[in-house]
Amino acid sequence: IWELKKDVYVVELDWYPDAPGEMVVLTCDTPEEDGITWTLDQSSEVLGSGKTLTIQVKEFGDAGQYTCHKGGEVLSHSLLLLHKKEDGIWSTDILKDQKEPKNKTFLRCEAKNYSGRFTCWWLTTISTDLTFSVKSSRGSSDPQGVTCGAATLSAERVRGDNKEYEYSVECQEDSACPAAEESLPIEVMVDAVHKLKYENYTSSFFIRDIIKPDPPKNLQLKPLKNSRQVEVSWEYPDTWSTPHSYFSLTFCVQVQGKSKREKKDRVFTDKTSATVICRKNASISVRAQDRYYSSSWSEWASVPCS
Amino acid sequence: RAVPGGSSPAWTQCQQLSQKLCTLAWSAHPLVGHMDLREEGDEETTNDVPHIQCGDGCDPQGLRDNSQFCLQRIHQGLIFYEKLLGSDIFTGEPSLLPDSPVGQLHASLLGLSQLLQPEGHHWETQQIPSLSPSQPWQRLLLRFKILRSLQAFVAVAARVFAHGAATLSP
């Protein structure tokens, strides 16, 4: 058993049929010695008396809010949550496996630049009695500070018969050094509590590996005289790190016909303009990627050819 | 060439070669690293590689103030990785397929380090740890880790030379 926060405790249980469970001793936080009784949740049934209560925690029915009273007055509470371990593996019932980029990916994170700011998100099908708390650091043995906000519900989607809820959190490294080569990864830890079930999820990454620039901005076409060619131009996204002579992007320009089956013409360039042939009913799209490190491409910015 | 005593390197040449290094490092190992290393003896094997750290003056302001600190750090790293790529980790078994880009990568690391330091001038270099695995397949794990960290190192070096070519070239 360990303390998650004040008056909230997590009991770690090996979860199998007829498991013996864990013996837990609760102590009433009071100077009083006599006349103390214990109850669980809303029940008025007295579970025991005395300053301490010893219980055998085996299942969710044994978890909940234990309260000690004296003469009708509440003295203190202890909330017990359960953390299940099945076949040596901690349960992952609360969050959905996003399976990208690999199986058992529960947390996904992205950064728009090298400033040390990043966003993580996760999915669940649970809609109520759900709380999350997020902690982060750079490195684990001698951790350096990363500050995370509160996790918020950022999207709801319908998937078949199920509703899916996306939560996200923003974090900022306290003393980020955008130009340095990271040697210690960022660690993100999410505590998830659903009713009386506790789970924790972790992710470890370098900012450089989760970079995904915003799409290029101000995408414009300029027809070239007496030609089917056009000059496409664009600018670095506002959110990208500066100076651009140091934090450079490379770009992919694509001409795509109306039909998905039509052949795509692609040009790669380090410049912020390119000359392409504009076909009727086609669209021109541009996306960006770090020039020197192959992290994710941005989403496409697009304009119609006409 | 970088000349002892703090004069400028050939920024544009260094820019071109460092960008080529980035391309080669990614062609040698294109994955962004989703190999399952958990069941391999994942002891920390590449913690001793030289990293370009915050105080090394490789940020735009530091380069403007005095690029020599940063160039020396880059040079140290290039020599370190050049030695690693020429070591038993990459030459031992399992041997690399004949068309492996590691040979080119090795030569380019040497080429860029020579651009930064002409004959007769010596910056101190870091000792490379002797990592000769007793199990042949462990070399794959070491290669994986070395190339992942080389990709990060050459990305910073390429940014330095691109910025230098754009803002510090005579």
Epitope: - | L37, E93, P94, L96, P101, W137, L140
Partner: antibody, heavy 126, light 111 residues
């Protein structure tokens, strides 16, 4: 064509040593390894060790605790396996085999003992 | 050392029937969680062994009645329709860790 030709059968006394040779032809000797495998009469195969002339790396089966020495002479494309302190249980056919062991930079690719010598019967008897 | 245990020791199968040979490793012989460093060799009487499966992939020229499967610690070589020329002893070999180790062999005969 690729050939591995081993030296002839040997009868040895307990406590003595034997040195079996394996002459390779038909390929670039230093581009491959040589593996030594033995097979006692009516028994299975036992890996003794492997030598890669290009890198100079040699891998041994510790079971033989310093009794086995594997060498290669690049000038004559010949590999050797010497086994000392012979005992009766060392009576076996000793094979050399060409080892091809390659990978992409970071991924397993191929390991094959693709060509074998004809075998050398070593009999240890007093 | 990784111990490779083959079963059965011998197997008598009618011509055209299926033969299944098992090989169990005392610990995982997977590399990076995906590729199995496991190989199958066929040895006919009076001959040196011949490679038929390498890193769980068939060698070229091996008839497609042979198939290899398994991962981690448990592997199987199957001959879907036994032919007279398949009579031999079959060995599995792991090369995940030095010393590389062979299984004890499975003798396949015609019933």
């Amino acid at each position: 064509q690729v050939q591995l030709v081993q030296s002839g059968a040997e009868v040895k006394k307990p406590g003595s040593s034997v040195k079996v040779s394996c002459k390779a032809s038909g390929y670039t000797f230093t581009s491959y390894g040589i593996t030594w495998v033995r097979q006692a009469p009516g028994q299975g195969l036992e890996w003794m060790g492997e030598n890669y002339p290009r890198s100079g790396n040699i891998y041994y089966n510790e079971k033989f605790k310093g009794r086995v020495t594997i060498t290669a002479d690049k000038s004559t494309s010949t590999a050797y396996m010497e086994l000392s302190s012979l005992r009766s249980e060392d009576t076996a056919v000793y094979y050399c085999a060409r080892a091809e062991f390659i990978s992409t930079v970071v991924a397993p690719y191929y390991y094959a003992l693709d060509y074998w010598g004809q075998g050398t019967l070593v009999t240890v008897s007093s | 050392d990784i111990v490779m245990t083959q079963s059965p020791d011998s197997l008598a199968v009618s011509l055209g029937e299926r033969a299944t040979i098992n090989c169990k490793a005392s610990k995982k012989v997977t590399i990076f969680g995906s590729t199995s460093a496991l190989h199958w060799y066929q040895q006919k009487p009076g001959q040196p062994p011949k490679l038929i499966y390498n890193l769980a992939k068939p060698e070229s020229g091996v008839p497609d009645r042979f198939s290899g499967s398994g991962s981690g610690t448990d592997f199987t070589l199957t001959i879907s329709s036994l032919q007279a020329e398949d009579v031999a002893v079959y060995y599995c070999l792991q090369n995940k860790e030095v010393p590389y180790t062979f299984g004890g062999g499975t003798k396949v005969e015609i019933k």
